[in-house]
């Protein structure tokens, strides 16, 4: 699996969306995961709603909400008010059972806003970071999600 | 009607090789795990593997991880067994199941019989 | 890799009666996030394909009859027949799918007195 490198502004939230198959992880929860180290285990930061079919609901541990459409194939992670020690690698995961299957890798950056930097000069504009592997990058608050309530069976 | 029909009973010597089959018929055969099941003669049922055709995506149990390779070729809705190299021990009854994304099995196959004798 | 081990061997039973086949797991197959039992019951009627009868724990499947029912928690489960009929014989399997491999018990085979 490649990385996705995502690019928040500090203090600002961050939304990664994680595509999969919606037929192949039906009846699986989501999670997202913060890897320790390059080869270590990935901790659990918030994982989807315990009732499948509820999963549309947004489910939060801390700054980091998680909310997945299981009809369109879409887990959405918004980390809010980003702050500097929310950089690293995280994972998207499918769960079965005490088993994770890693969806999507990827690489959380953290941009200092140039308004507080003493030594900026001319204001500096990230680029919108490139949306490949299913994952994009908002630089804004997070829009409500309007979902389709999934089918129970 | 949703049907696994696999190939017909092979009697084979040590030492060759051996592709059998389970095709799907009556859904979508690229958005369903399929697993393979082994029983040997009076035994129990032990699971070998998975694969999912929409990708291909295989998951072996570490029993099996080696010895066999499963397959599948969602253009004609067949997944495939094989082997490079049969022992006597492979005989047995191989059944395909249908899974869902949990893995429990709602569809089997009629079974498919290896024999390997010298 | 868990260890599913069920009792008895054998059954006899007597149509009409209630029948009951235990499984035991050497982890528990409870997920405590989801509140699931990964449990399944199989059963392979004589010269038959295996069939599904119970998923996860206790749920029945598409056309089982309600006479089998599935219960237990943690690493202790059962599978009762009541009211056994003829047509029940075979040998029953429970199987594991928490964590992979999945893993089946060594069967019971129930058959009439």
């Known amino acids: 699996l490649n990385t996705t490198v995502l690019q928040g502004m500090a203090g600002q939230s961050l939304r990664v969306s994680c595509t999969y198959d919606a037929l192949k992880h039906w009846g699986r929860r989501k999670a997202w995961c913060r890897q320790l180290g390059e080869e270590g285990p990935c901790q659990r930061v918030v994982s989807t709603h315990g009732v499948w079919l509820l999963a549309f609901l947004k489910k939060r541990n801390g700054s980091t909400v998680i909310a997945d459409d299981t009809l369109a194939g879409t887990v959405t992670i918004t980390l809010k008010n980003l702050q500097a020690g929310d950089a690293g690698l995280y994972q998207c995961q499918s769960l079965r059972g005490r088993e994770a299957e890693v969806l999507q890798k990827v690489l959380v950056e953290v941009l200092e806003d140039p308004l507080d930097d003493q030594d900026a000069g001319d204001l500096w504009v990230p680029e919108e970071s490139s949306s490949f592997e299913g994952a994009q990058v908002e630089h804004s608050t997070s829009r409500n999600q309007e979902t389709s309530f999934p089918p129970t069976s | 009607e949703v049907q696994l029909v696999q190939s017909g009973s092979e009697v084979k010597k040590p030492g060759e090789s051996l592709r059998i089959s389970c095709k799907g018929s009556?859904?979508?055969?690229?958005?369903?795990?399929l697993a393979w099941v082994r029983q040997m003669p009076g035994k129990g049922l032990e699971w070998m593997g998975i694969?999912?055709?929409?990708?291909?995506?295989?998951r072996y149990s570490p029993s099996f991880q080696g010895q066999v390779t499963i397959s599948a070729d969602k253009s004609i809705s067949t997944a495939y067994l094989q082997w490079s190299s049969l022992k006597a021990s492979d005989t047995a009854m191989y059944y395909c199941?249908?899974?869902?994304?949990?893995?429990?099995?709602?569809?089997w196959g009629q079974g498919t019989l290896v024999t390997v004798s010298s | 890799d868990i260890v599913m081990t069920q009792t008895p061997l054998s059954l006899p039973v007597t149509p009409g009666e209630t029948a009951s086949i235990s499984c035991r797991s050497s982890?528990?197959?409870?997920?405590?996030?989801?509140?699931?039992?990964?449990l399944d019951w199989y059963l392979q009627k004589p010269g038959q394909s295996p069939q599904l009868l119970i998923y996860?724990?206790?749920y029945r499947a598409s056309g089982v009859p309600d006479r089998f029912s599935g219960s237990g928690s943690g690493t202790d489960f059962t599978l009762k027949i009541s009211r056994v009929e003829a047509e029940d014989v075979g040998v029953y399997y429970c199987?594991?799918?928490?964590?992979?491999?999945?893993?089946f018990g060594g069967g019971t085979k129930v058959e009439i007195k």
């Open positions: 199941a249908r899974g869902t994304p949990l893995f429990y099995f709602t569809y």
């Open positions: 009556g859904y979508s055969f690229s958005s369903y795990w």
């Open positions: 199987m594991q799918r928490i964590e992979s491999p999945l893993t």
């Open positions: 694969i999912y055709p929409g990708d291909s995506d295989t």
């Open positions: 982890q528990s197959l409870l997920d405590s996030e989801d509140g699931n039992t990964y």
């Open positions: 996860t724990l206790s």
